[in-house]
């Protein structure tokens, strides 16, 4: 059990107060983390509270400002990037968000040697992506879907690609679906380790169907937003990977990297690129039916300045029980011999673990094992491998950092974080300097987050980087809810849940219950992390019990649970939420006449299906930006879990798993449906179709749209949204305002 103390003592009860909705909307109790911007083994940059860019040297203990807030302010810079030779800094301003990761900006180059902005051959605007080479101060950037190269910031640019065209051809940046569902980045170009070569992807969206929606703005006529967006079964982008020698780009142009024959024989995806050395690169490819992935190691052939990918250096990863990988196929971490690598994939027992591949995947040496999962490989040095897992004390919702000494035999394992601040910190991530000389640990909870700096050899804590003292003080007079993480065993399935309980929780009383659900494949909601958010307020002030349940399809508990939903989304996720609710009722403190469910995105889909399950368990519920039919969602994501919506594949379940098919079942529940009209991700179409089906079935429901808002419903919409949902729930639970 993880209990977050409510710090309520009888003598202090008068000074303590409950959380308010205003606290949540104002971000009063938000926390800070500290991720060093490493620039060497022992140095990092950090933007100070007053916006100076400061360089810290851990070994000398010295720090000095490399860029003043005055210079930052002169161009309204909101971000910066130091060139590896430390001669220049790019300053980023005019940030303009596009999709989840992508944005455009204006870039200025500041010369640190003379304290002036570089004049002449200035960068065009707005730029879609810009980055320094890993060595020196070459610049690669993407402008109007084409890639440009500068040998030095003041030089004229060299244009690498010429075919870039809005919504048609994307060079060096992903199209919508690759950004959201495959790469999870705003860029699609990669420098080789010493900056000799630049690899990039070209995405051809010419044949992709376009989603079009109105953006109302302030004009007399709305604008139409057009995005090439492949829905399930539709034509997909065509991807090609090229590499160019940046030293002599005018001599030999971009050389295409060949696609493995077994991948190229049908529709496929490129999933990631990892440079090994300046003359060796590793590409990962995936069949459109995403249960076969191929890792291909390619070498530079000097005689023709081309890239050769021998079949002997192709490694196949295949899943027979689900899709390849977890959410994404894992990426390799190469060892110092520049050919063998470490990678996370399923072992014979169906748990994701670290394997060492020297020649073939069949001969892989398993490095970790057990009924838990390795989650991320952070760094491999010559003698250590650092990774995270949820092994400790068998809580899947924890993350601890481990070190395996690979330099000695047999390799020994040490948990770096398990006992550091055991009550406060059970969910960590890490950030390593060059050669893992030093590292930062960022603890996310369950207590107040804390960031610390450590020696990479001894693991000794050197200093606290951020401990959120102000937050700790601000919370001293707040009645926080109690939180517990436990598990239910039902029909050989383990359902982990987090329960958030009112501060003066009394097991002999009855409380309204709100289920918060996400439930998407390879997600995890039950995590040992700190949060003061809307549901904290609902428990603290409104006296609700809130529960989050990780059912079938969720991650980090083995393939049996993960792949249970393969090809049948919308069945077991819903069943498991319902099962958990029944178990919660059996605990005796839930008012079974006041049970609600809510979720966003995939959670909106699950909450809608749960409300329409016909169980009579739920009095009311909310779906925010829900998927309503898998035929409406993106190909890359949907087909990974559902296959294709064709008669000879899985069309039947595509049709059976829609929210619209269950319209009649909403008759006996109070349903609040919410969506942004400019949602580029889960299109407004999804909610429009639910509403149409409910109207056609003559079922009453409530709805709210947010004009010109995307999938995040940000800004003032957030305040309106949570206020609206609060009123809805209080009304449903007969709680006075």
């Amino acid at each position: 059990i993880v209990l977050r103390p409510s710090r309520v003592h009888n003598s202090e009860e008068n000074t303590m107060r409950a959380l308010t909705l205003k606290d949540i909307l104002n971000g009063t109790f938000s926390y800070k983390t500290f991720f060093p911007n490493w620039i060497s083994g022992q140095e990092y940059l950090h933007q100070s509270a007053d916006n100076n860019i400061v360089l810290y040297n851990i070994e000398t203990g010295q720090s000095y400002t490399i860029l003043s807030n005055r210079t930052m302010k002169s161009v309204n810079a909101s971000n910066y990037g130091l060139s590896p030779d430390r001669q220049f800094v790019y300053l980023e301003s005019d940030y303009s968000k596009l999709w989840r990761y992508s944005y455009t900006a204006t870039y200025y180059i500041y010369d640190l040697s003379n304290g002036e902005f570089v004049r002449g051959n200035e960068l065009p605007r707005p730029i879609q992506y810009l980055c320094w080479s890993p060595v020196g101060s070459k610049l690669a950037y993407v402008y109007q879907n084409n890639i440009y190269l500068k040998q030095r910031p003041g030089d004229p640019p060299f244009q690498i690609t010429f075919n870039g065209r809005e919504n048609k051809i994307f060079n060096g940046i992903p199209d919508w679906v690759y950004e959201e569902e495959m790469l999870a980045t705003k860029y699609a170009l990669w420098w080789s380790p010493n900056g000799k070569f630049l690899a990039y992807a070209e995405f051809n969206d010419t044949d992709i169907p376009v989603i079009a929606y109105s953006y109302y703005g302030d004009e007399q006529y709305p604008r139409t937003i057009n995005i090439p967006y492949p829905k399930a079964g539709a034509k997909n982008p065509v991807v090609r990977i090229f590499i160019i020698d940046t030293t002599y780009p005018a001599y030999v142009g971009p050389q295409e990297v060949p696609v493995p024959a077994m991948i190229a024989s049908s529709d496929y995806y490129f999933s990631w690129l990892t440079w090994v050395t300046d003359e060796r690169v590793c590409l990962q490819w995936l069949k459109r039916v995403q249960n076969v992935s191929v890792l291909s190691i390619c070498d530079f052939r000097e005689d023709w300045q081309t890239w050769d990918c021998p079949k002997t250096q192709e490694h196949i990863e295949e899943s027979r029980t689900g899709w390849a990988g977890g959410f994404f196929v894992s990426t390799p971490v190469f060892s110092y011999d520049a050919i063998s690598y470490y990678k996370i994939f399923s072992d014979k027992d169906g748990y994701k673990h670290i394997h060492y591949i020297k020649d073939t995947v069949e001969n892989a040496i398993q490095i970790t094992s057990g009924k838990w999962e390795a989650i991320n490989i952070f760094r491999v040095t010559q003698d250590s491998l650092f990774y995270s897992s949820n092994e400790f004390e068998e809580y899947p919702g924890r993350r601890n950092i481990y070190r395996i000494s690979i330099g000695s035999y047999p390799p020994s394992k040490k948990c770096v974080t398990c006992h550091l601040r055991k009550e406060r910190c059970q969910y960590y991530t890490a950030s390593f300097s060059d050669y893992a000389k030093y590292y930062a640990l960022v603890c996310y909870g369950p207590g107040i987050p804390i960031s610390t700096l450590h020696d990479g050899r001894t693991d000794q804590e050197i200093k606290i980087l951020e401990e959120n003292k102000e937050l700790e003080n601000a919370l001293k007079n707040i009645q926080l809810p109690k939180e517990e993480i436990k598990k239910l065993e039902v029909d050989e399935i383990t359902l982990w849940y987090k329960m958030i309980l009112p501060p003066q929780f009394d097991r002999s009383k009855k409380y309204p219950l709100l289920i918060q659900v996400y439930g998407g494949p390879c997600s995890q909601s039950v995590r040992s992390v700190f949060a003061v958010n809307w549901i904290s307020y609902l428990a603290s002030k409104e006296g609700m019990v809130i529960a989050l349940v990780d059912g079938r399809g969720t991650a980090f508990q083995g393939d049996k649970l993960l792949y249970a939903v393969y090809r049948k989304l919308g069945v077991y996720e819903v069943e498991d939420q319902i099962t958990a609710v029944r178990k919660f009722i059996e605990m005796g403190f839930i008012d079974e006449k006041r049970i609600a469910i809510w979720g966003w995105s995939y959670g909106g889909y699950v909450s809608s299906l749960a409300l329409a399950s016909g169980t009579g368990l739920f009095k009311c519920g909310i779906a925010v930006a829900p998927v309503s039919s898998w035929e409406y969602y993106a190909s890359v994501y949907t087909e990974r879990f559902m296959g294709l919506p064709t008669k000879d594949d899985n069309l039947e379940h595509y049709k059976n798993s829609t929210v619209m098919a269950r319209a009649e079942y909403f008759r006996n529940v109070d349903y609040l449906l919410i969506h942004g009209t400019a949602d580029d991700n889960v299109h407004f179409q999804n909610s429009a179709q639910i509403a149409k089906a409910l109207v056609n079935a003559q079922v009453d429901f409530q709805a709210m749209w947010y004009s010109d808002q995307n999938h995040g419903l940000s800004g003032l919409s957030t305040n309106h949204l949570y206020t609206h949902m609060t009123h809805f729930l209080k009304q449903c639970f007969s709680l006075s305002d």
Partner: nanobody
């Protein structure tokens, strides 16, 4: 792996013109810089024109600037050298080649003889 075959050479009077052609087979050469070299009797090979893969970047030494024009047709896998206002000193064997930076590879054609004489 790749073959380069030059044609179009011959005997021409001073002030006359010739168009040399280079046909490439095997590897696609659209992403390589192509060039024309010449070698006069008893002398080394000298670059007379190059055209980059970008298609727009051409290079000529001062000795031929304004008289020679290099062009390429990637679809047909051809590289051309238009030579105008020919002089006696242009007499040489002309070779088509793939040009690599700072490296010399023997990706040459067999050459075509150009003789400028009255």
């Amino acid at each position: 792996e790749v073959q380069l075959v030059e044609s179009g050479g011959g005997l021409v009077q001073p002030g006359g013109s010739l168009r040399l052609s280079c046909a490439a087979s095997g590897r696609t050469l659209s992403s390589y810089t192509m060039g024309w070299f010449r070698q006069a009797p008893g002398k080394g090979r000298e670059l007379v024109a190059s055209i980059s893969w970008v298609d727009s970047i051409t290079y000529y030494p001062d000795s031929v600037e304004g008289r020679f024009t290099i062009s390429r047709d990637n679809a047909k896998r051809m590289v051309y050298l238009q030579m105008n206002s020919l002089r006696a000193e242009d007499t040489a064997v002309y070779y088509c080649a793939v040009i690599f930076p700072e490296q010399v590879y023997d990706y040459w054609g067999q050459g075509t003889q150009v003789t400028v004489s009255s």
